[in-house]
């Protein structure tokens, strides 16, 4: 950066090098160049010479004033016009930053995705700060009082093996940058209550043409959790509104769910599950598309294609005509 240059004087910022966006700031430049009484001192921002709001304070020092500074980052340097020098002489440079103190982190959520071996904690960080902001996740055992801290810039994965203070914990998030510090409320968790079953997948669909045609959706999960509650939502791709069916599920075998659907229409299906009575749902599964047959008296078996959407930490799912994220508490 510009701060690595060799200086013949120095440059400083008031109130500070990192300051709140929208503030009035002053940048001072003081020359210390051998055999040079500067005729003029110049300021440059991102390589462009500034022409206004420059005040000469004394023989060696000048001030540049900015009102309502709104740029997140700028590289400043100043130069001197020395007698008997054809070119301007570089005095010094500094990178400056503006931004905001962090908001109070809220919506702190911790879940354990089955088989992951990790507890994943996320939160809403609030408005963009524009400056480097670090987050410290505190995990404190309600049984032993031992506290672990984890430094991160976004979410955190904490190995469940490191949670050796029993099953009950408090989790809170501390946000800090050069402009301030804030802290979330404390979230109380029980490790057994935050497990999300392993992903549920719709594998195939089958339409049986009878007097009333019937579609069977086959779906499964590798979960070892015994009591699981699931929801399957479905709609015609041309519709805005979802229909939802609820199931109490035992995944010792592949699930088969029956639907009576309109003929010759393309449908979208998604499923999600939770451990019965617990807080958190899976994200909705990848969209599964199935077109029902026209009403012809025969049996057809058909595997329909999956859409290869990302089904990562937060999964986008089509709701009422816009994208929503659905792995929150119900």
């Amino acid at each position: 950066g510009i701060t690595n240059i060799n200086c013949s004087g120095h440059i400083w910022v008031e109130p500070a090098t990192i300051f709140k966006m929208g503030m009035n700031i002053s940048i001072y430049c003081q020359a210390a160049i051998k055999n040079c009484q500067p005729r003029q001192l110049h300021f440059y921002k991102n390589g462009i010479k500034e022409r206004f709001e420059i005040t000469r304070i004394n023989k060696t020092t000048a001030r540049l004033w900015y009102k309502n500074f709104l740029e997140p980052h700028a590289s400043m340097y100043c130069t001197a016009e020395c007698p008997n020098h054809f070119q301007e002489t570089l005095i010094c440079g500094k990178d400056i930053s503006s931004g905001y103190p962090p908001d109070v982190p809220d919506e702190v959520t911790c879940v354990i995705y089955e088989y992951s071996g990790n507890m994943t904690c996320t939160w809403n960080a609030g408005k963009l700060t524009y400056v480097d902001t670090k987050y410290v996740v505190h995990v404190k055992s309600l049984e032993t009082e031992e506290e672990q801290q984890y430094l991160t810039s976004s979410y955190i994965n904490i190995s469940t093996d490191s949670l050796q203070g029993g099953k009950k914990y408090l989790v809170w998030v501390q946000a800090e940058n050069a402009l301030g510090m804030e802290e979330s409320k404390q979230l109380q968790i029980h490790l057994d209550d935050i497990v999300i079953p392993s992903a549920s997948i719709i594998s195939r669909a089958e339409t049986i043409n009878a007097t009333v045609p019937k579609t069977i959706i086959y779906w499964d999960s590798q979960t070892t959790i015994e009591k699981v509650s699931c929801e399957m939502r479905y709609k015609a791709t041309t519709n805005q509104t979802w229909n939802v069916k609820e199931f109490d599920t035992n995944f010792t075998y592949v699930q088969q769910s029956e639907f009576y659907l309109e003929p010759n229409i393309k449908y979208i299906f998604q499923v999600r599950c939770q451990e019965t009575g617990k807080r958190y749902w899976q994200a909705w599964s990848s969209p599964f598309f199935h077109k029902t047959t026209e009403t012809v008296p025969q049996v057809t078996s058909k595997s329909s294609q999956h859409n290869t959407w990302n089904s990562g930490l937060t999964v986008a799912s089509i709701s009422t005509g816009h994208l929503t994220s659905d792995n929150r508490e119900d």
């Epitope: 009082e145 031992e146 506290e147």
Partner: antibody, heavy 121, light 112 residues
């Protein structure tokens, strides 16, 4: 058994600075732990100054009255925690204790013997 | 979080049952400790996690409470128990607005 020994106390003029040391033995310095500073003015109650948390990263916490004037740091190679006190005032006259449980809990099983700081002209 | 301890002073006799209370300004779960301090000495941990007895502390000392209201009880006062007692919240110190984590103290003196 954890042992804490404070040093560095003494007489200092108002506006002056002082650095107190707390040498610790018996702590596993590779584990997570809190080391805290507490003071007690003559005839008064216990007053928390701040703590340093040492784990996968280092964090410091201060009472809001101590922010800006007091700084806690540590030197792992010397198993020592420091309290740097600046712009001292007469009301900072107190016995200063370091305290810990040798782990990442915030109650204090172990206390130093205390070191007296007197701020006076 | 503010810790309010009461009473600030208390006179009692050997053999008496004594109760000291401590109130937190917000929920601190069971994260509360009690200390005993004698003149010229460092404080000594008596109780942690609201009700757990520290090593070497006589069983006549007991603690109770959770959330915001806590109690230290000495079931039968002994001569060596006359001292000053402090409560301390041990929930979290990362909050930017903490002034003190200790209560103001309760001075227990001999009656008469």
């Amino acid at each position: 058994e954890v042992q804490l020994v404070e040093s560095g106390g003494g007489l200092v003029q108002p506006g002056g600075s002082l650095r107190l040391s707390c040498a610790a033995s018996g702590i596993d310095f590779n584990s997570n732990y809190y080391m805290c500073w507490v003071r007690q003015a003559p005839g008064k109650g216990l007053e928390w100054i701040g703590c340093i948390y040492v784990g996968s990263h280092v964090n410091t916490y201060y009472a809001n009255w101590a922010k800006g004037r007091f700084t806690i740091s540590r030197d792992n190679s010397k198993n020592t925690v420091y309290l740097q006190m600046n712009s001292l005032r007469a009301e900072d006259t107190a016995v200063y204790y370091c305290a810990t449980s040798g782990s990442s809990v915030l109650y204090f099983k172990f206390w130093g013997q205390g070191t007296l700081v007197t701020v006076s002209s | 979080i503010q810790m309010t301890q009461s009473p600030s002073s208390l006179s009692a006799s050997v053999g008496d049952r004594v109760t000291i209370t401590c109130q937190a300004s917000e929920n601190i779960y069971s994260f509360l400790a009690w200390y005993q301090q004698k003149p010229g000495k460092a404080p000594k941990l008596l109780i942690y996690s609201a009700s757990k007895l520290a090593a070497g502390v006589p069983s006549r000392f007991s603690g109770s409470g959770s959330g915001t209201d806590f109690t230290l009880t000495i079931s039968s006062l002994q001569p060596e128990d006359f001292a000053t007692y402090y409560c301390q919240q041990t929930n979290r110190y990362s909050n930017p607005d903490i002034y003190n984590v200790f209560g103001q103290g309760t001075k227990l003196t001999v009656l008469g």
